[in-house]
Structures are given as C-alpha cells and as structure tokens.
C-alpha cells in the first residue's frame, strides 16, 4: 500500500544507521519527474537540511545542506541508475565520514558530512513519486 | 475532496474555452514545491506539449511547448501572485491569439498560441501540490 | 534572527519617482521573503509588494504598474521603486520579513520601525 507524499517521519541518526526508501516515478523520464529526500534538523519543514539529496529523473542528482537558511556549494551528478517507470530502492547509510547512497543496490553517490548526522530531526521524502516503504534502521549498541 | 496528482483528463479546447483548477502549494515556498499544467496533442504523457505550465512557487513561472519531442523558447515570469500555503484558483482561458492565465481572478500570465488550441487531446495537472478542482469548460456554440 | 531598517523617505512631488531601501541584519537575510507594507494616517496597514528568497515578486493592485522590488543578497537589502506617485501614497512604508510568502500583515516575523513618505500634489 502506497504511503502519503510528502512522507515525514521523525528519525535519528548516527554512524551505522540507513534509511532505505521504495518507490517509483510518477511521470515518464521525458517530463522530468523529480524525487527529494531531505534530513532535516527540526520537525518543521522551514528547518535546515543536513542533508538535500534531488533526483531530476533522467537528467542528473544534486546533493547540498541548508545551513542558518542558505544554501550551500552544491555537489551535482549526471550519474542515473534509475529507470523509466520502474521500482527503485534508495538506501542512505551514515558513514563515519559521508553519506552513502545506494540504488537498487548499488553504490551510486557520496556526501560529506557538512554538519555531524547527529543533528537529524525528521526526514522528508517528496516530489514525484509514489513511495511503498520507508525505514530507517538503528545500529544495535 | 482530493482529486488524485497527477491527475490526467481528455479534452478539447478551441477560443472560448477555459481551464479551472483549485489547488494548494504541498510544501513551504522555501522548499520550491512546483506546480505543472501541460497541455497534450495525444492521451500520452510523452505527447507533444501546445501549452507547458510550471511554477516554481516563489521564484519564477515559465512557459512553453514541446514540438515534436523538443521543448521551445522558453517564456519566463518573475511575477508571483501565488501565496505560501494558500489555496489558489487558477484558470487558463483560450483567447484567439494567446493563453491568459488568471490567478485568484487576476490576469497574471499570457502565451502567445504556437499550436493552434483544437490540437490539445489531454490536460494533465501534476507536482507538489493537492488538487480539489478540474474543470474544462466550452463555449456553446 | 533578522533586524530590518528601512531608508529613502521624505517630502515627494506626485508625478516624481521614490526608491526606498530595507537594510537587513543577520546571516538568514536570504531565506526570509521580504514585504512591503505601509499605513496611512488613520488606515489599516496594507500590503504594497513582497519579493521571495528566490526572486519572485508581486505588487498590490493599487501599485501595479507603478512599483519594482527586488533585493540584493549580497548587500542583505531589499528596494522599492514607486513611479507616478499620487497624494494617496502618502503612508509610512514598513519593510517586513517573513518565513511565509504571504501578503498578510499578521505572518510576518519581522517589522522595521518604518519611512514616513509624503507625496504633494
């Protein structure tokens, strides 16, 4: 059963911890759906974004932080292993040092960390898609 | 009640007819939610394009077509009459020689017909917004 | 946090032009979207133009086609150009700023204490 988008959900997160996200492209790769996954460091939307992960569908992934408000340098990829109207499974490791981003298993961007995971409030998944699964997974202590 | 996005329906425009549609911006201008009105030659989403609608909310609107599988010249607007969480009406009335857009009951945009308007076969209405109105309607003849 | 000052007002012939100024304070300037209001003597306050963070605008009916905003990140500044100014402009204009884009005094988070702009016929 598909789950509500924007999908919200209160997380923490630290070394070792994944988020991994199901779905799928709501409109052909020719109109440029778009899919957005922010980790945000307070419930309210407005926050600041540790980290801002786009995927313009056929056309490339960008990847920044929103830090006191601004946008920061943006890190850009034209690496696309998404496909037309399929199923894609998207999971986002906390690293020591970087964010780790999977798809349908994958290793297919990285991210530096600009501010410490630890500051992650709420992550938002939004834009066009139509989303089945959303977890984030704990590392047992 | 919600009507679903992106929502996808049949019709034929010629001068006089006019496009109604209520919505709401899904998420804070802050985040640039986009709202898209496409206009199709066929009932396929990868159809040619007479009319292509997209506001980025808070920052600009732009217009165009796609011919034969190319987008145009591109028609930008900075004016911003929609507002931050709040419901719009918006309606796109077909004069002879252009499209003029209202918002909230004002004359906000206008594009010139590159393709003539009995050309559109399909309306489509998508991005971050929900939609509780779709109306197509025809001038009597 | 976000302080606001405004600039630019004074004694204006109808006809002339006025550019007033929003001096912002704070290293969120560019998030907020910035409002212009004003209040004339005895008058609710109403809303002239507004600016978004990234650059939309919108002016009220009763400037359109006589008003320009727009704002200058680097300079943490917000500008109103009025054209064709009318005895009826006459108002303190208050700078604002806001998390939301709306037109509604009520939303906004910040005020500047306001420009007292008198326009003589």
């Known amino acids: 059963s598909l789950l509500p988008v924007p999908y919200t959900e209160a997380a923490s997160l630290s070394t070792g911890s994944t988020v991994t996200i199901k779905g799928r492209p709501l409109a052909c790769f020719l109109n440029e759906p778009y899919l957005q996954v922010d980790f945000h460091t307070e419930m309210k939307e407005e926050s600041d974004i540790v980290f801002h992960f786009q995927v313009c569908f056929g056309r490339r992934v960008v990847m920044n932080s929103r830090e006191y408000g601004a946008w920061k340098q943006q890190v850009e990829s034209k690496n696309m292993p998404f496909q037309d109207g399929q199923e894609f499974e998207l999971s986002i490791s906390v690293l020591p040092d970087k964010y780790q981003v999977m798809v349908n298993g994958q290793s297919s961007y990285t991210f530096d960390h600009r501010i410490k995971p630890e500051a992650v409030k709420m992550v938002q998944v939004w834009r066009d898609i139509s989303l089945t699964k959303f977890n984030v997974s704990y590392l047992k202590r | 009640s919600l009507l679903p996005v992106p929502y996808t329906e049949a019709a034929s425009l010629s001068t006089g007819s006019t496009v109604t549609i209520k919505g709401r911006p899904l998420a804070c201008f802050l985040n640039e939610p986009y709202l898209q009105v496409d206009f199709h030659t066929e009932m396929k989403e990868e159809s040619d394009i007479v009319f292509h609608f997209q506001v980025c909310f808070g920052r600009r609107v732009v217009m165009n077509s796609r011919e034969y599988g190319a987008w145009k010249q591109q028609v930008e607007s900075k004016n911003m009459p929609f507002q931050d969480g709040q419901e719009f009406e918006l309606s796109i009335s077909v004069l002879p020689d252009k499209y003029q857009v209202m918002v909230n009951g004002q004359s906000s945009y206008t594009f010139d017909h590159r393709i003539k308007p009995e050309a559109v076969k399909m309306v489509q209405v998508w991005r971050d917004i929900s939609l509780t109105k779709f109306n197509v309607s025809y001038l009597k003849r | 946090q976000v302080q606001v000052q405004e600039s630019g007002g004074g004694l204006v012939q109808a006809g002339n032009s006025l550019r007033l100024s929003c001096a912002a304070s704070g290293r969120t300037f560019s998030s907020y979207h910035m409002m212009w209001f004003r209040q004339a003597p005895g008058k609710e306050r109403e809303f002239v133009a507004a600016i978004a963070w990234r650059g939309g605008t919108y002016c009220a009916n009763s400037v359109k086609g006589r008003c320009t905003i727009s704002r200058d990140n680097a300079k943490d500044t917000v500008y109103l150009q009025m054209n064709s100014l009318k005895p009826e402009d006459t108002a303190v204009y208050f700078c604002?700023?806001?998390?939301?884009?709306?037109?509604?005094?009520?939303?906004?988070?910040?005020w500047g204490k306001g420009t007292l702009v008198t326009v003589s016929s």
């Open positions: 604002a700023a806001s998390l939301r884009y709306v037109f509604d005094p009520s939303a906004m988070d910040y």
